[in-house]
Interface confidence: low
């Protein structure tokens, strides 16, 4: 999501941000959920060979080999079973890294909403970050950029999108007359509201930050149960629980 109308953040002040790369190029964003798990948008991985994918943590300037950076391959991808590429419905996936991140000042976790949390209501102040272009003309950012946005009423957003939204989408607006938000190169990055990942960058309009087509996110709170179910089922356990079986290939 190219961040429009934003600002460069203090380096490593968003330690949960992940850069998903293919062919050595930044492709999408994501956030670190657990030391071995990254949440991103499902559409980022359509027709992509996971073997060529890398996840970079602890980055600020992507073009620099910063000492804080940790680079991982992608062990497994779990896309939401109801993801629909045409409508962007249920646009969420989980990446299991091929190693565990070492948590520290530059690499940290971001929590999703609680299982019973309600999504942010219209007017809530949030922020969205990414390494995408900073203009409509493929201008690269100096480092990780962030924009402050506000949650938009779903009726208003749905009207702007001609009725095409689904119930598990979340929208934002700039909050003032300036163009502010994301576009297309950092899908999967988190919308952070009240220090929780309430949204995942999903899609937007032709022009960055255009209020006529507000930014649309996957509403994370609708998928919290699914997220933790995937993590629980796929993570190695200390020992089998009574009445359960370990997933194939998982060592005790």
């Amino acid at each position: 999501a190219q961040i429009i109308g934003g600002h460069e953040v203090t380096p490593h002040s968003r330690p949960y941000m992940a850069s998903v790369r293919f062919g050595g190029q930044h492709h999408c964003g994501g956030f670190l959920l657990r030391a071995r798990w990254v949440v991103s948008a499902a559409h980022c991985f359509s027709h992509r060979d996971l073997r060529t994918g890398l996840v970079v943590l602890g980055a600020h300037v992507l073009s620099t080999a910063e000492p804080t950076q940790q680079v991982f391959g992608i062990d497994a991808l779990t896309t939401h079973p109801d993801y629909h590429p045409m409508t962007h419905a249920n646009d969420i996936c989980l990446l299991r890294l091929n190693g565990s991140a070492v948590l520290g000042p530059a690499v940290g976790l971001l929590r999703p909403p609680g299982r019973r949390a309600r999504p942010p209501t219209a007017g809530t102040r949030c922020r969205v970050a990414g390494w995408g272009f900073v203009s409509d003309f493929e201008e690269l950012p100096p480092g990780l950029m962030e924009a402050k946005v506000r949650v938009l009423d779903p009726d208003v957003c749905n009207s702007s999108w001609k009725g095409h939204l689904t119930l598990t989408m979340l929208c934002t607006r700039s909050g003032d007359s300036h163009r502010r938000g994301f576009c297309s190169a950092d899908s999967g990055g988190p919308l952070v509201c009240r220090n929780r990942a309430h949204g995942l960058v999903s899609f937007s309009g032709l022009w960055c930050g255009d209020p006529k087509t507000p930014d649309v996110y996957t509403q994370v709170s609708a998928f919290v149960a699914w997220i933790w179910d995937v993590v629980r089922r796929s993570s190695p356990q200390p020992g089998p629980l009574p009445g359960t079986t370990r997933p194939p290939g998982e060592a005790a």
Epitope: V156, S159, L170
Partner: antibody
């Protein structure tokens, strides 16, 4: 098929209490907030309040604040409207309705129950 | 609270007539307006949401328009089953508020 079924209405004296139930089926109860809307005889619609069943958050109209309490039992897919200190002007048909948008606190109501009549009279 | 004022409060029309009901909000509500139809003894039914979007299963003779403070519900060719009371509702801010209703009667 989405269904909302209210029950618990009846005749009650001024100052009395009544609890209405709204049994929901055909959708994921915790994904949508539930509103209560009332309609006095021959009058228009008035929103009473709403609950988000997934965390129990509630919101009330000023006219009922402090007297009415909305709750939900997610294990039973049921929302409740507890009405205390009832007045004659609370006489109405009470409807529960599903709020269509997952993240709208209250908003467009796409499915409604059949309503239950509450009469407050001595 | 935002006030929603409907006009007219009632109207008489014949089958086949074009009927227009208006709703005015006391402040800007963008396009966050819904329209409902209610028949005697029945619950309201959603017709239009987001000012102009036809709800699933609603006949195409119903249409909505407007943004800001002024909104319109139009029935292009009134059918016998359309005689009912119609309500507008803003969902822009809490609490949601309804118009007082417009009763469409047979002429």
């Amino acid at each position: 098929e989405v269904q909302l079924v209210e029950s618990g209405g009846g005749l009650v004296q001024p100052g009395g209490s009544l609890r209405l139930s709204c049994a929901a089926s055909g959708f994921t109860f915790t994904n949508n907030s539930i509103s209560w809307v009332r309609q006095a005889p021959g009058k228009g619609l008035e929103w009473v309040g709403a609950i988000s069943p997934n965390n129990g958050s509630t919101y009330y109209a000023d006219s009922v604040k402090g007297r009415f309490t909305i709750s939900a039992d997610t294990s039973k897919n049921t929302a409740y409207l507890q009405m205390n200190s009832l007045r004659a002007e609370d006489t109405a048909v009470y409807y529960c309705a599903r709020n269509a948008w997952h993240y709208s606190w209250v908003g467009v109501m796409d499915y409604w129950g059949q309503g239950t009549l509450v009469t407050v009279s001595s | 609270d935002i006030q929603m004022t409907q006009s007219p409060s009632s109207l008489s029309a014949s089958v086949g007539d074009r009927v227009t009901i208006t709703c005015r909000a006391s402040q800007d509500v963008s396009t966050a307006v819904a329209w409902y139809q209610q028949k005697p003894g029945k619950a309201p039914k959603l017709l239009i949401y987001s000012a102009s979007f036809l709800y699933s299963g609603v006949p195409s003779r119903f249409s909505g328009s407007g943004s800001g403070t002024d909104f319109t519900l139009t029935i292009s060719s009134l059918q016998p089953e359309d005689f009912a009371t119609y309500y507008c509702q803003q969902s822009y801010t809490t609490p949601p508020t309804f118009g007082q209703g417009t009763k469409v009667e047979i002429k």
